[in-house]
Interface confidence: medium
């Protein structure tokens, strides 16, 4: 028998009592549904509070721990330990002092290797008698290189003025040999320790043009925020060569990104940074030291468009008008201009310091360890957005002999572009990438 | 010269606190941490704290939170070092010590150390 | 933490030989790494730091050497005023130091 569809029995039921009629919609929506909402928004609103309390604590605070308390957030990276443990300063741009001398060196003669004597002081020529791989790597490690080396022999030239001595190795430092005789091979130790300073493409001499990554594969943009903020040159897998004052507005490193191998600023992925570090600021030269090593998270992987350029040679003395490259996504005009999409090029020359501090130009502010550049006429020149990108000289690879740094105005006739000298800063980077090999 | 002139002995009853004082001078008292580390008799030494002279910031090992205090006199470029609920084992020769910052800097100069000794 | 550790506890060593002291680091400390020279009664003496930098007025016959975890001083001619007791101590971005247990050198 099918049963009446409205009857109150249950379809299994005998003789049992018949069920309440159901409550109507509107009477289970007062007694249940209403309390829900209220619980629901109640927990919606404390969710909105919590997270908005925690937007604004850290927006405005930080949280030491042990004991638990909270700073400003303005005290993070002041260079002060407001948390007990420091963490207030653990991620932010570190200082290094200068250092001592690294024992060792390159010579822009052929990159040959010479080692220094501590109880003399004097500098003498690596004789490549008995020179081995292990020593090669011992001479790198000293520079704070941890890629493999490699050498050759060169001959030693008419007007070599150093001694030349042969080498050993104690306490993983080159010394000279004690019984060192006479230089047997007349070879001297030609040293390389990372390839470098190699495009794939050469550019071409004209005023400013659009660059192409492939002739500046070291070139990145280093961003803070995603906001382009400064250049920067790729040194070896882990380190980025840039300008100190790039991080005076921003010294906590977790928002700092860098973007390597395109010539395009937004079309590359961000590299996460592990370290910056800078030398301890100088107040009377305020604008020395303008130079920043960030080291890299993870290391990069070298390709057509990543690779590393050299560091200068010690002796890289450049003569006024020697040519010389700049590269950047700066300013194109100098007030109210943008900065460029592209990655544009342009060659300039060595302008003489003496000609550079007279009385119409710096009058005496650029330091020995700084560096001019531009045109004589003007016109050409890096702009606000280019600081911290290199300036390259080509022999027989790209070399990088200084960072952008300061001016005034861009591109005016007496005020060329000021950038900071790196052959006068080899020990203190040697000495930083040996610290954190 | 730099120079780092601590106070002398001290002897304490358990459960009493001791405070020893670091004079510096040869500097500038502010631009330098000062940091604390004890050796008990024919023991290695054992780093206690560090303060900032120039804001008066301060942090402690882990093993003395709650006991020791450190506080400076910018005047007198002195800086204090106070310990407290003193046990036997707190018998110990106490250092100052200066770092040129508290960042990547070891302690280039140490006071002549402190002898506190407790028992009752 | 990282915890440092010296080996040997003592070094017996003649005097005009070379002595060779170790010291390893629980995890990498890059060459934040200081040497300290203690002879009794006296305070502790800035030897090393930065691994292999000597600190002023430093003798050159105290050398120190290593990176990452492992780390050695080497005192090439020890001297009457060598023997002593030297501890290295892991310095870096964080305020919070460490010493290994220290190692005593003495006259054979």
């Known amino acids: 028998m099918l049963q009446d569809p409205d009857s109150d029995q249950p379809l299994n039921s005998l003789d049992v009592k018949p069920l309440r009629k159901p409550r109507i919609p509107m009477e289970t929506f007062r007694k249940v549904g209403i309390p829900i909402i209220i619980a629901l928004l109640s927990l919606a609103s404390i969710i909105i509070v919590v997270v908005l309390i925690k937007v604004i604590l850290d927006k405005y605070y930080f949280l030491c721990g042990q004991p638990l308390h909270f700073i400003p957030r303005k005290q993070l990276c002041d260079g002060e330990l407001d948390c007990p443990l420091g963490e207030d300063e653990e991620h932010c741009v570190k200082s290094f002092p200068e250092g001592p001398a690294v024992a060792v060196r390159l010579s822009k003669d052929r990159s040959t290797l010479q080692v220094l004597d501590s109880a003399t002081g004097n500098w003498f020529s690596a004789c490549f008698d008995n020179f081995t791989e292990a020593l090669a790597e011992t001479a790198c490690r000293q520079m704070g290189y941890s890629s493999k080396p490699t050498f050759r022999a060169v001959e030693i030239g008419p007007d070599q003025d150093l001694d030349v001595v042969e080498i050993t190795e104690n306490s993983q430092e080159l010394r000279m040999r004690n019984s060192s005789g006479p230089c047997l091979s007349g070879s001297l130790v030609s040293l390389h320790c990372l390839a470098c300073g190699k495009s794939l493409k050469t550019p071409r001499v004209v005023g400013v043009e659009e660059a192409s990554v492939d002739s500046w594969p070291w070139q990145v943009s280093i961003q803070y925020d995603k906001q382009h903020v400064c250049g920067g040159s790729i040194l070896d897998p882990h380190w980025v060569l840039t300008a100190a004052h790039c991080f005076r507005k921003h010294t906590d490193v977790f928002n700092w990104k860098v973007r390597a191998g395109s010539d395009k600023l937004g079309s590359f992925p961000s590299l996460a940074v592990a370290k910056i570090i800078i030398i301890e600021f100088n107040p009377m030269y305020p604008k020395d030291n303008d130079i920043a090593l960030m080291k890299l998270q993870f290391p990069l992987t070298f390709s057509g468009t990543v690779r590393p350029i050299c560091l200068p040679f010690f002796d890289e003395e450049l003569t006024p008008a020697t040519p010389l490259w700049i590269i950047g996504w700066g300013f194109t005009k100098q007030n109210g201009g943008k900065m460029s999409d592209i990655l544009l090029q342009a060659s300039v020359q060595v302008i003489d310091s003496t000609r550079c501090n007279a009385d119409d130009a710096y009058q005496g502010e650029v330091t020995e360890k700084m560096m001019c550049a531009g045109i004589p006429e003007g016109g050409v020149d890096t702009c606000q957005g280019d600081s911290g990108g290199p300036l390259m000289y080509q022999s027989d690879q790209w070399h990088v002999v200084g960072i952008v740094s300061w001016g005034y105005g861009c591109g005016g006739p007496s005020t060329p572009g000021v950038y900071t000298k790196v052959s006068a800063y080899l020990n203190w980077i040697y000495n930083v990438w040996k610290a954190e090999l | 010269q730099v120079q780092l002139v601590q106070s002398g002995a001290e002897v304490k009853k358990p459960g009493a606190s001791v405070k020893v004082s670091c004079k510096a001078s040869?500097?500038?008292?502010?631009?330098?941490?000062m940091h604390w580390v004890r050796q008990a008799p024919g023991q290695g030494l054992e780093w206690m704290g560090w303060?900032?002279?120039?804001?008066?910031?301060?942090g402690y090992a882990q093993k003395f939170q709650g006991r020791v205090t450190m506080t400076r006199d910018t005047s007198t470029s002195t800086v204090y070092m106070e310990l407290s609920s003193l046990r036997s084992e707190d018998t110990a020769v106490y250092y100052c010590?200066?770092?040129?910052?508290?960042?990547?800097?070891?302690?280039?100069?140490w006071g002549q150390g402190t002898l506190v000794t407790v028992s009752s | 933490e990282i915890v440092m550790t010296q080996s040997p506890a003592t070094l017996s060593v003649s005097p005009g030989e070379r002595a060779t002291l170790s010291c390893r680091a629980s995890?990498?400390?890059?060459?934040?790494l200081a040497w300290y020279q203690q002879k009794p009664g006296q305070a502790p003496r800035l030897l090393i730091y930065?691994?292999?930098t000597r600190a002023t007025g430093i003798p050159a016959r105290f050398s120190g050497s290593g990176s990452g975890t492992e780390f050695t001083l080497t005192i090439s001619s020890l001297q009457s005023e060598d023997f002593a007791v030297y501890y290295c101590?892991?310095?870096?971005?964080?305020?919070?130091?460490?010493f290994g247990q220290g190692t005593k050198l003495e006259i054979k």
């Open positions: 101590q892991h310095y870096d971005s964080s305020p919070m130091y460490t």
């Open positions: 930065g691994a292999s």
């Open positions: 303060m900032n002279p120039n804001s008066g910031n301060t």
């Open positions: 010590a200066r770092a040129r910052t508290w960042l990547l800097s070891p302690f280039d100069y």
């Open positions: 995890q990498s400390v890059g060459r934040y």
């Open positions: 040869g500097y500038t008292f502010t631009t330098y941490y």
